[in-house]
Interface confidence: medium
């Protein structure tokens, strides 16, 4: 990954905090367990343009929806090292694309106010978005070699805690919105047919909170809701998740501690907050957004299927690229008939609409939607379409 | 409140077959994902079968692989185990729980023993 | 499989004492991209089904009263009860949610002294 030198890691840090804005969206569900549903305004839409989806590496939804405390919009990414460099992006094409380090967007896309905790409950409609297991190389508290472009929610504490991986597919918005995990539906595995149903091999990552229980790992992406489908469950969940529907918990978190500490570290990481991740383009332009989708999909290793998207835990320093025993592949490629193949190149009808596919290392798959008078296009794979009246109002 | 409660365990003899079902209530249930976890008597436990919210995918331990089946209507809210070729290893109480998208295993029915003997 | 073994397998503590159980993982839980341990533990009482207690290793579910707490990280993991109470009489296990199978451990009875 071409990196270009910032001054310091604050530096980059303070870059990239800019560039992420959180899209608030409600799960018309959630009401039902009483909780308050964030507002239909999607605070981040100012910016009208190319929309970018990005499907990190194995973030699960799982607990994505536990926001019990008001998650203030404010999110970094954290990318490798110190220096924030350039991001490089394949194109479908497979032409690498260098996207800015410094993806800036307006500050009005940041989202900062402080959201009220949207614990959106997956209102699958045919797809699971159960945990699936994942296969990721289990990095100690030092960061790992290869850091997933990490979202961080600024809880208030000058330290932010808690960490999103870049995971979009459990937005919070109303049910027909709502993306069911179970992406690869071509795939076969077993007990369903296109399902991609087993485990992945080891856990994943998921760092999405459904509600207010633990995470679990990514899977593949289905669609569920229209067209549209995130990852599996072996993405979603780093372990053996059993939410291919991108399921999410019900459980109010707000009665749940953080054993010995108090903080709310582990409770965010499974909260999905109720805004999206969205990273701004490196000219901060309203022209080009891009929307990060965290690595919910951690596509892990699926025993019955043949498509692996993760390592498995335990292997810290592991490069994704390519997986030990040739079976894993680096983020945003899969294991298909052997070889590691890219998401985009896999599925050419990844991004709906005429989004185009875009590889980011450590990230995995971004969707750059189409843009049209009067009409574009967003979400993780540019499924949803909004017109300007819709965003104005 | 959460509630889940297990039904349709028994005596069966070996190679016989036997459909568990467990009905939910309290909670979304096609939101979530739901996991079969049984206990041998004064053993500890096993992991069985899981089933996604959308019972589009399913998983199972290789112990009952082939032999068991996870499904859910969600209409009913309830999740089923259909248990074939029974074996005298499978003797246990077995337990329907609600899934955390962690995979643990939040909310537990009181469970249905299941007697596999001749 | 990822193998759980926990220590001991009984343990006998006083009232109001500390009782600490163990787990240990054959791989490690932990995910690096979200710096989670998928690790859970569970109280089972005679005749009733388990209860989770922590998930992730450290993190409580809600309802568990805070004398319980979850420790460790990668194949090492810890259960405390800070202060042992009578109704705290149970079966402890750990289990692994990382990978399929989910796997548990063979569970540690704590009993009072």
């Known amino acids: 990954v071409p990196a270009r030198e910032t001054g310091s890691a604050i530096e980059a840090e303070e870059l990239v905090r800019s560039s992420l804005a959180w899209e608030s969206r409600a799960n018309d569900t959630r009401e039902e367990a009483g909780l308050p549903a964030a507002g239909e305004d999607e605070t981040s839409w100012t910016e009208r343009g190319s929309e970018m989806a990005a499907v990190g590496p194995g973030v699960g939804p799982e607990e994505a929806l536990e926001a019990s405390a008001a998650v203030t919009g404010t999110a970094w990414l954290e990318a490798d090292g110190p220096g924030l460099g350039g991001v490089t992006a394949e194109a479908g094409s497979g032409d690498a694309q260098t996207l800015p380090a410094t993806l800036q967007a307006p500050d009005e896309a940041l989202g900062s106010s402080t959201m009220p905790p949207a614990i959106p409950e997956a209102t699958e409609t045919s797809g699971p978005p159960s945990p699936a297991v994942h296969d990721k190389p289990s990095v100690g508290p030092e960061l790992p070699k290869e850091i997933p472009l990490e979202v961080r929610l600024n809880l208030g504490g000058s330290t932010p805690e808690p960490t999103f991986p870049l995971q979009g597919t459990l937005e919070t918005q109303p049910a027909s919105d709502i993306i069911d995990i179970d992406y690869f539906e071509g795939l076969d595995s077993e007990g369903r047919g296109a399902d991609m149903g087993s485990f992945p091999g080891s856990p994943g990552t998921s760092e999405n909170h459904p509600d207010t229980e633990g995470e679990t790992p990514s899977w593949s992406l289905l669609d569920l809701y229209d067209d549209f489908t995130p990852f599996d469950e072996s993405d979603f969940y780093p372990t053996t998740s059993f939410y291919d529907d991108l399921e999410e918990e019900e459980e109010e978190e707000e009665d749940k501690d953080t054993v010995g500490g108090g903080d709310l570290e582990d409770e965010n990481d499974l909260l999905l907050p109720s805004q999206k991740p969205g990273v701004g383009p490196g000219t901060g332009q309203p022209t080009n957004r891009w929307h990060a989708v965290p690595p919910q999909h951690t596509l892990g290793m699926v025993p019955g299927s043949s498509i692996s998207l993760r390592p498995r835990p335990g292997d810290p320093g592991k490069d994704l690229a390519s997986g030990e025993n040739g079976t894993e592949c680096r983020v945003g490629f899969v294991r298909h008939n052997g070889s590691c193949r890219s998401v985009c190149d896999l599925f050419p009808s990844y991004c709906h609409n005429g989004g185009q596919c875009y590889l980011v290392e450590n990230i995995g798959a971004f969707c750059r939607c189409n843009t049209q008078d009067y009409i574009w296009h967003k979400g993780m794979r540019c499924e949803s379409i909004i017109t300007d009246f819709q965003v104005m109002c | 409140e959460v509630q889940l409660l297990e039904s349709g365990g028994g005596l069966v003899q070996p190679g016989g077959s036997l459909r568990l079902s467990c009905a939910a209530s309290g909670f979304t249930f096609s939101s979530y994902a739901m996991s079969w976890v049984r206990q041998a008597p004064g053993k500890g436990l096993e992991w069985v079968s899981a089933i996604s919210g959308s019972g589009g995918s399913t998983y199972y331990a290789d112990s009952v692989k082939g032999r068991f089946t996870i499904s859910r209507d969600n209409s009913k809210n309830t999740l089923y185990l259909q248990m074939n070729s029974l074996r005298a290893e499978d003797t246990a109480v077995y337990y329907c729980?609600?899934?955390?998208?962690?995979?643990?295993?939040?909310?537990w029915g009181q469970g249905t023993l299941v007697t596999v003997s001749s | 499989d990822i193998v759980m073994t926990q220590s001991p397998d009984s343990l006998a503590v006083s009232l109001g004492e500390r009782a600490t159980i163990n787990c240990k993982s054959s791989?490690?839980?932990?995910?690096?991209?979200?710096?989670?341990?998928?690790l859970a533990w569970y109280q089972q009482k005679p005749g009733q089904p388990p209860k989770l207690l922590i998930y992730w290793a450290s993190t409580r579910e809600s309802g568990v009263p805070d004398r319980f707490s979850g420790s460790g990280s990668g194949t090492d993991f810890t259960l405390t009860i800070s202060s042992l109470q009578a109704e705290d009489v149970a079966v402890y296990y750990c289990q692994q949610t990382a990978t399929q199978p989910l796997t548990f451990g063979q569970g540690t009875k704590v009993e009072i002294k």
């Open positions: 791989q490690s839980v932990l995910y690096s991209s979200n710096n989670k341990n998928y």
């Open positions: 729980a609600k899934t955390k998208p962690n995979n643990a295993f939040d909310y």
